[in-house]
Interface confidence: low
C-alpha cells in the first residue's frame, strides 16, 4: 500500500491520575504506513529520554495501517515543574516532523 502519514494527537494527564501522584502524557499516532515512526518528547523544549514507552497496534485489517501510542510518565511533582509538553513525530509520510503540544494548566 502507499505511504500514509499519521494523524497526531496529544493528551494531558487526567485530574484523576494527578491525584494519585503520577502524570502520564500520551501522544497518539493514528492510521499510518509503513510502521516505522519516531516519537520524541520535549518538556519546556528539553528533549526527554528514558521515561517514555511505546505501544504499536498491528496492522488494521481494513486499511493495513498502524497506530502507535507513546506515553511519557512523570511524577506529579515533576509534571507541575514544567509548562510546555510536546511530542515530535517523524515519519516518511511527513515532509517534516509534526509537533503537537499543550501548556500545562491551559487545556
Amino acid at each position: 500500500r502507499t505511504v500514509a502519514a499519521p494523524s497526531v494527537f496529544i493528551f494531558p494527564p487526567s485530574d484523576e491520575q494527578l491525584k494519585s501522584g503520577t502524570a502520564s502524557v500520551v501522544c497518539l499516532l493514528n492510521n499510518f504506513y509503513p510502521r516505522e515512526a519516531k516519537v520524541q518528547w520535549k518538556v519546556d523544549n528539553a528533549l526527554q529520554s528514558g521515561n517514555s514507552q511505546e505501544s504499536v497496534t498491528e496492522q488494521d485489517s481494513k486499511d493495513s495501517t498502524y497506530s502507535l501510542s507513546s506515553t511519557l510518565t512523570l511524577s506529579k511533582a515533576d509534571y507541575e515543574k514544567h509548562k510546555v509538553y510536546a511530542c515530535e513525530v517523524t515519519h516518511q509520510g511527513l515532509s517534516s516532523p509534526v509537533t503537537k503540544s499543550f501548556n500545562r494548566g491551559e487545556c
Epitope: V3, A5, G93, L94, S95, S96
Partner: nanobody
Framework: QVQLQESGGGLVQAGGSLRLSCAAS????????MAWFRQAPGKEREFVAV????????YYSDSAEGRFTISRDNAKNTVYLQMNNLKPEDTAVYYC??????????????WGQGTQVTVSS
C-alpha cells in the same frame, strides 16, 4: 504539473561517494518540499531524506543520517543527495519526489523515473 529528472547514479565501490541530482520543472520550485526515496530489488520503496520548501529544514532516515546530505539550489530548480561512505546495502534505484501541497503534508504527488545506484563490495 511537475517534471522530475534524476541523474548521477552509477557503480561505486563500498566506501565511495556519489552525488545525485534531481532537476525539476513546471512549478515554482522553492515552494515545495523535495524528498529522496529508494527501492532495492524485492523491497518496498523507502524514505531517505527530505528538504522543506525554501531550503531550510531537512530530515533523514536512520540509515542516511550522518552519511547522506540533502540540499537544494532554488535558482537551478535542483535538489541534490550527496552520499558518502556508501555500503552495499545502499544499492537501489533512487527516486526524487515532490510534495507541492501548501502545508507540505508528505503527499508526494510527483515522482521521477529513478537513477540506479550500485555499491560493490
Amino acid at each position: 504539473q511537475v517534471q522530475l529528472q534524476e541523474s548521477g547514479g552509477g557503480l561505486v565501490q563500498a566506501g565511495g561517494s556519489l552525488r545525485l541530482s534531481c532537476a525539476a520543472s513546471g512549478r515554482t520550485f522553492r515552494n515545495y518540499a523535495m524528498a529522496w526515496f529508494r527501492q532495492a530489488p524485492g523491497k518496498e520503496r523507502e524514505f531517505v531524506a527530505v528538504i522543506r520548501r525554501g531550503g531550510g529544514d531537512t530530515y533523514y532516515s536512520d540509515s542516511a543520517e550522518g552519511r547522506f546530505t540533502i540540499s537544494r539550489d532554488n535558482a537551478k530548480n535542483t535538489v541534490y543527495l550527496q552520499m558518502n561512505n556508501l555500503k552495499p546495502e545502499d544499492t537501489a534505484v533512487y527516486y526524487c519526489a515532490a510534495d507541492v501541497s501548501d502545508d507540505n503534508t508528505g503527499k508526494y504527488d510527483y515522482w521521477g523515473q529513478g537513477t540506479q545506484v550500485t555499491v560493490s563490495s
